[in-house]
């Protein structure tokens, strides 16, 4: 029998990239009957929430107002049932954006290419930064990193219709503080007709799957099974 509770799932509501001075919302999904959830930031306690009533709710939301570089970093959460704590969730990287300047994104040979052509994106930012990030809208977890003093290049290799979509880039002042996003560049890949149906237009920011899936029990639980989730010795 287990002596630990399942680890919770931590998510960012809407997006993990939060413009400065805006509110971030993180969700911690644990178990029905959990008494308390703790949000930890860089290993230290950051916030506590208690679901009301605990037996009807399987998680909580943590609101982080006025986002800034001091609040950007690695978050995790834990919860307890009775006095037993769960394992820690996986780490979530929360990024603050709209810091300082706006980079320029361009694509070579151009925004309209044929399937199989080699494509390179260029991200340029004149202020002091060495890391650049390229994101495809709707795929914001798939961040490509590249390094350069003022400009970085992102070679894509031979493209397919799966590469179609809007791209933005950021300059990064550290792992968790990013510039304003560039204006989007829409890559249109023609040809390769038989694969076209496999590459629908991507959703725009924020990622549609990057949401909080907290649920509320409608009926009263007939027992407190969760209290007996763990062995007593």
């Amino acid at each position: 029998p287990k002596q630990t509770l399942p680890k919770p799932i931590i998510r960012a509501e809407s997006t993990y990239m939060v413009p400065k001075e805006k509110q971030a919302t993180l969700c911690c999904q644990g178990s029905y009957g959990a008494v308390e959830y703790q949000l930890h930031f860089e290993g230290s306690l950051f916030a506590v929430e208690r679901p009301k009533p605990p037996e009807r709710i399987n998680g909580v939301k943590f609101h982080i107002p006025d986002m800034n570089s001091r609040k950007a970093g690695r978050y995790s959460c834990i919860y307890r049932v009775g006095e037993l704590w769960s394992e820690r969730s996986d780490l979530l990287d929360l990024v603050v954006t709209e810091m300082y300047d706006t980079p320029t994104l361009s694509v070579h040979p151009g925004p309209e290419v044929t399937s199989g052509e080699k494509v390179t994106f260029y991200c340029r930012l004149d202020t002091a930064t060495s890391m650049f990030l390229l994101l495809k809208e709707g795929r914001s977890r798939d961040v490509q990193r590249s390094y350069g003093k003022v400009q970085a290049e992102f070679p894509m290799g031979p493209v397919t219709t799966a590469h179609r979509g809007s791209y933005r880039c950021f300059g990064s002042y550290n792992n968790y503080a990013w510039s304003f996003p560039s204006e989007p560049v829409k890559l249109l890949v023609t040809g390769d007709i038989e694969n076209t149906s496999l590459a629908p237009t991507d959703p725009t920011f924020p990622d549609s799957w990057d949401t909080c899936l907290l649920t509320r029990e409608t009926g009263l639980q007939k027992d407190l099974a969760l209290w007996d989730h763990t062995a007593q010795n």
Epitope: Q3, T4, R50, K52, E55, G82, E83, L84, T230, Q232
Partner: antibody
Framework: QVQLVQSGAEVKKPGASVKVSCKAS????????MHWVRQAPGQGLEWIGY????????EYNQKFKDRTTLTADKSTSTAYMELSSLRSEDTAVYYC??????????WGQGTLVTVSS | DIQMTQSPSSLSASVGDRVTITCRAS??????LAWFQQKPGKAPKLLVY???NLADGVPSRFSGSGSGTDYTLTISSLQPEDFATYYC?????????FGGGTKVEIK
């Protein structure tokens, strides 16, 4: 079976520190929190705080936060509570208590700490 | 901090009596309440957790009830070994706090 065995009684002078140990056996030490509770003579129960031996994370009753340090040694399955700047009103029996999904399910036998000049 | 107010502070009863002890929290604790029994010179023993659940090995004459802010421990038929002090305790937030105790004495 689960056992929490505490160190013996202590007599201390005001201003001194005391460190009480609690050796756990019969379960996986790192899977459960260890709480500390005290009881002054003829009085009720007062929660001091807890430690998660797995992570070392601690949480304290604000009343004791400045004077109490909770630690745990995973290699010996032993939890410790150190109380500094002792005063006469700290005279009490100190208990270590395992925290489980059912709350405070196993208690140590208690350690009497007497503070007297 | 959540205050736990226990009543009565003491009571006298005879073997076979039905005994009821109440505990009131200063705010809703959502059934996150435990009851303990303590005999002189001994550590407390867990009787009830999550307001209504009997701990392992606790006789069925003990029962817990209540929700929100008001909770009750009932001993349906008092036995000689039940003369002791009883405490309620919440574990809804920090700090965990205990009621002041109810001493059950022989009439």
């Amino acid at each position: 079976q689960v056992q929490l065995v505490q160190s013996g009684a202590e007599v201390k002078k005001p201003g001194a520190s005391v460190k009480v140990s609690c050796k756990a056996s019969g379960y996986t030490f790192t899977s459960f929190t260890m709480h500390w509770v005290r009881q002054a003579p003829g009085q009720g129960l007062e929660w001091i705080g807890y430690i998660n031996p797995s992570s070392g994370y601690t949480e304290y009753n604000q009343k004791f936060k400045d004077r109490t340090t909770l630690t745990a040694d995973k290699s010996t399955s032993t939890a410790y509570m150190e109380l500094s700047s002792l005063r006469s009103e700290d005279t009490a029996v100190y208990y270590c208590v395992r925290g489980s999904s059912r709350g405070f399910d196993y208690w140590g036998q208690g350690t009497l700490v007497t503070v007297s000049s | 901090d959540i205050q736990m107010t226990q009543s009565p502070s003491s009571l006298s009863a005879s073997v076979g009596d039905r005994v009821t002890i109440t505990c009131r929290a200063s705010e809703n604790i959502y059934s996150n309440l435990a009851w303990f029994q303590q005999k002189p010179g001994k550590a407390p023993k867990l009787l009830v957790y999550a307001a209504t659940n009997l701990a392992d090995g606790v006789p069925s004459r003990f029962s817990g009830s209540g929700s929100g802010t008001d909770y009750t421990l009932t001993i349906s038929s008092l036995q000689p070994e039940d003369f002791a002090t009883y405490y309620c305790q919440h574990f809804w937030g920090t700090p965990r706090t205990f009621g002041g105790g109810t001493k059950v004495e022989i009439k």
